[in-house]
Amino acid sequence: FERTRSLQDPCSNCPAGTFCDNNRNQICSPCPPNSFSSAGGQRTCDICRQCKGVFRTRKECSSTSNAECDCTPGFHCLGAGCSMCEQDCKQGQELTKKGCKDCCFGTFNDQKRGICRPWTNCSLDGKSVLVNGTKERDVVCGPSPADLSPGASSVTPPAPAREPGHSPQ
């Protein structure tokens, strides 16, 4: 089938990095500057992606492959092929349309991206709070209160000033 196709369509012989030039008797011509063809038999070359402004070049365009972009530091990629750049926030914050905002009490975010999530509710697993949660860190659940009867454990949990096990409603 490939041989038959080659006989019928001279363009099928044009390799990646070239295009089948109808203006020149279907001769295989190299892709012009700032364009590429990633497969053989192409009748046109695609324009290279330009990484500018908030985007920076991760991989230069070549005659056979498109440029690849990532985001300038302070922002991170979103979408297939880094189609968008989104602002980083600090740990303990989440991104809103108003910019980076601190996590509400009872929630945390330990990354520079993503949303604030509720602290673990230790009591749902029958456990107690060993370490209080913060905006940047989840609570640490310890043994269940029953396990902490005298002599059962050498761990003495601090008495928290507040019970941070759930997000405020």
Partner: nanobody
């Protein structure tokens, strides 16, 4: 082709003012949130302000709140940043960028930006 072209940068003394413009083409400007960001020498890119499609919502980073004003003219496909009471720390390359057609809780990214215009604040 979607294009954003910034202009209006230059050298200004501390306390002075500048108005940056961003000319948009190749897309329906009025359908998108628009954003200003900047990059100071040796610093990370910083989000400054954004504005919704009709200009009724505007938000600013704390460091420019009360000094900078973002605005848009959809009839002219243009975005603006009025910068007053400029300080040395405002020295940076300023970029305008296109945000989403609709902001959601899942992302507040930008998919296109210009080449930038340089603002230098110095006496």
């Amino acid at each position: 082709e979607v294009q954003l072209v910034e202009s209006g940068g230059g050298l200004v003394q501390p306390g002075g003012s500048l108005r940056l413009s961003c000319a948009a083409s190749g897309f329906t400007f009025g359908n998108y949130w628009m954003i200003w960001v900047r990059q100071a020498p040796g610093k990370e890119l910083e989000w400054l302000a954004n504005i919704n499609q009709n200009g009724s919502e505007r938000y600013y980073v704390d460091s420019v709140q009360g000094r900078f004003t973002i605005s848009r003219d959809n009839a002219k496909n243009s975005l603006y940043l009025q910068m007053n009471s400029l300080r040395a720390e405002d020295t940076a390359v300023y970029y305008c960028a296109r945000g989403g057609a609709d902001y959601s809780n899942s992302h507040y990214g930008m998919d296109v930006s210009g080449q930038g215009t340089t603002v230098t604040v110095s006496s």
